[in-house]
Amino acid sequence: FERTRSLQDPCSNCPAGTFCDNNRNQICSPCPPNSFSSAGGQRTCDICRQCKGVFRTRKECSSTSNAECDCTPGFHCLGAGCSMCEQDCKQGQELTKKGCKDCCFGTFNDQKRGICRPWTNCSLDGKSVLVNGTKERDVVCGPSPADLSPGASSVTPPAPAREPGHSPQ
C-alpha cells in the first residue's frame, strides 16, 4: 500500500497570543503591543479596538482578547459590542433629535433611555386605576370597580413627591 505523508502546517502549533512569523522561519512570535490573537495558528495579530472619545475602556486588551468599551457617564451603549453611545435622559423623558423632552401626558418612561410609553389602560382588563400614572411611572391597576366595597375610593393619588404626568410640549 502507499504511505501518505501528512504535512502539518507548522503555524498550527502557534497558540493564542502569538502569530506565525513568516519573516522568522514561521516561528511563533508574541503579538506586538496593542494587538491580539484570540485563536491559535494565526499569521497576524489584530490591532486592538481603541476606546476613544465618548467610549471608555471597560476591559483592557490582552494578547489573547480584544478590548471592550462602554460609554462615558451621561451616555449608554447602542449597537453590537457598544459601537455607539446614546445620550442619557432623565426618567420621565425621552430622547428626540433635539435632545431630551418630557413625556407627554398619558405616557411615562421609568428609565434613562428609550421612549415614553402609554400608561396601561386598566379598563381593558376589567380593572380600575389604583394609583395614577406620572411621567416616570405607569398607573397601577387594582380590582375591578365591582369588587370594591361601597364608598371605597378607587383611585389613590401618587406620593406627594410625584407630580401628575403632564407636560406641555
Epitope: 481603541q50 476613544k52 465618548v54 462615558t72 447602542l78 449597537g79 459590542g81 453611545c85 446614546e86
Partner: antibody
Framework: EVQLVESGGGLVQPGGSLRLSCAAS??????????VGWIRQAPGKGLEWLAL???????YYSPSLKSRLTISRDNSKNTLYLQLNSLRAEDTAVYYC???????????????WGQGTLVTVSS | DIQLTQSPSSLSASVGDRVTITCRAS??????LAWYQQKPGKAPKLLIY???NLETGVPSRFSGSGSGTDFTLTISSLQPEDFATYYC????????FGQGTKVEIK
C-alpha cells in the same frame, strides 16, 4: 444649528508653520462626549484624517504626521486649532474641521463638517 | 494601521441604475464603518454610520451593510444628484478613509 468655520489658510513657505482655527457654534467643545478633529484633502486626492481632540482633552494624531501636528482648543472661544510644522509641498490641501458623532448618537464618524480652508505650500 | 480598500475606484452608471460600492478593511473592524458622499468643491456629507444606520435626512435609496472586514454601500436607484465621490471611513482604531469611488454619468 451646528456650524464649523475654518480660517487661517493661505500661502505658506516650505519649512514654515501654520495655525488653523475652527470656530464652533451650535454646541460646546467641552460638552461631554463631543470630539472634534481635522481632516485634509490634497487637490484631486482622497480624505486624510489628521487629529482629534475630545471634551476631556484627550488628543489623537495620525501616526505618520504625529511629530509635526498639535491639536488644541480654547473653550472660552469655543474654537479648535491645528498647528502643522515643517511644511512641505505635499501638505498643500483643503483642511476641514469636523465634529464626531451625530446629534444624540455619538460614535467614531463625522456628521458635521466645515467648508474647509485651503493651504498652499510653495516658495 | 488599518487600511480600507474601496472598489471600484470609479464607475459609470445611468440614472435609475442600482449601484454597489465595496469597502474592505485590512482586519476585522466590527461595525465601525461610515460612508460619505462628496461633490466637487464641497465638504463630505455623512450618509451611513455604524455600517448600516442611515443618517437623518439622507434618502432611503442609500443603504449600508456588512461587518468585520467587508462592507457595502448600495444606491438602489441612482438619481442625478448622486453623481459624486463616495468614501468609507473606519473608527475602530484611530480614523482612516478609503481612497474613494467616483460615480460618473454613463
Amino acid at each position: 444649528e451646528v456650524q464649523l468655520v475654518e480660517s487661517g489658510g493661505g500661502l505658506v513657505q516650505p519649512g514654515g508653520s501654520l495655525r488653523l482655527s475652527c470656530a464652533a457654534s451650535g454646541f460646546s467643545l467641552s460638552t461631554g462626549g463631543v470630539g472634534v478633529g481635522w481632516i485634509r484633502q490634497a487637490p484631486g486626492k482622497g480624505l486624510e484624517w489628521l487629529a482629534l481632540i475630545d471634551w476631556a482633552d484627550d488628543k489623537y494624531y495620525s501616526p505618520s504626521l504625529k511629530s509635526r501636528l498639535t491639536i488644541s482648543r480654547d473653550n472660552s472661544k469655543n474654537t479648535l486649532y491645528l498647528q502643522l510644522n515643517s511644511l512641505r509641498a505635499e501638505d498643500t490641501a483643503v483642511y476641514y474641521c469636523a465634529r464626531g458623532g451625530s446629534d444624540t448618537v455619538i460614535g467614531d464618524w463625522f456628521a458635521y463638517w466645515g467648508q474647509g480652508t485651503l493651504v498652499t505650500v510653495s516658495s | 494601521d488599518i487600511q480600507l480598500t474601496q472598489s471600484p475606484s470609479s464607475l459609470s452608471a445611468s440614472v435609475g441604475d442600482r449601484v454597489t460600492i465595496t469597502c474592505r478593511a485590512s482586519q476585522s473592524i466590527g461595525s465601525y464603518l461610515a460612508w460619505y458622499q462628496q461633490k466637487p468643491g464641497k465638504a463630505p456629507k455623512l450618509l451611513i454610520y455604524d455600517a448600516s444606520n442611515l443618517e437623518t435626512g439622507v434618502p432611503s435609496r442609500f443603504s449600508g451593510s456588512g461587518s468585520g472586514t467587508d462592507f457595502t454601500l448600495t444606491i438602489s436607484s441612482l438619481q442625478p444628484e448622486d453623481f459624486a465621490t463616495y468614501y468609507c471611513q473606519q473608527g475602530y482604531y484611530l480614523w482612516t478613509f478609503g481612497q474613494g469611488t467616483k460615480v460618473e454619468i454613463k
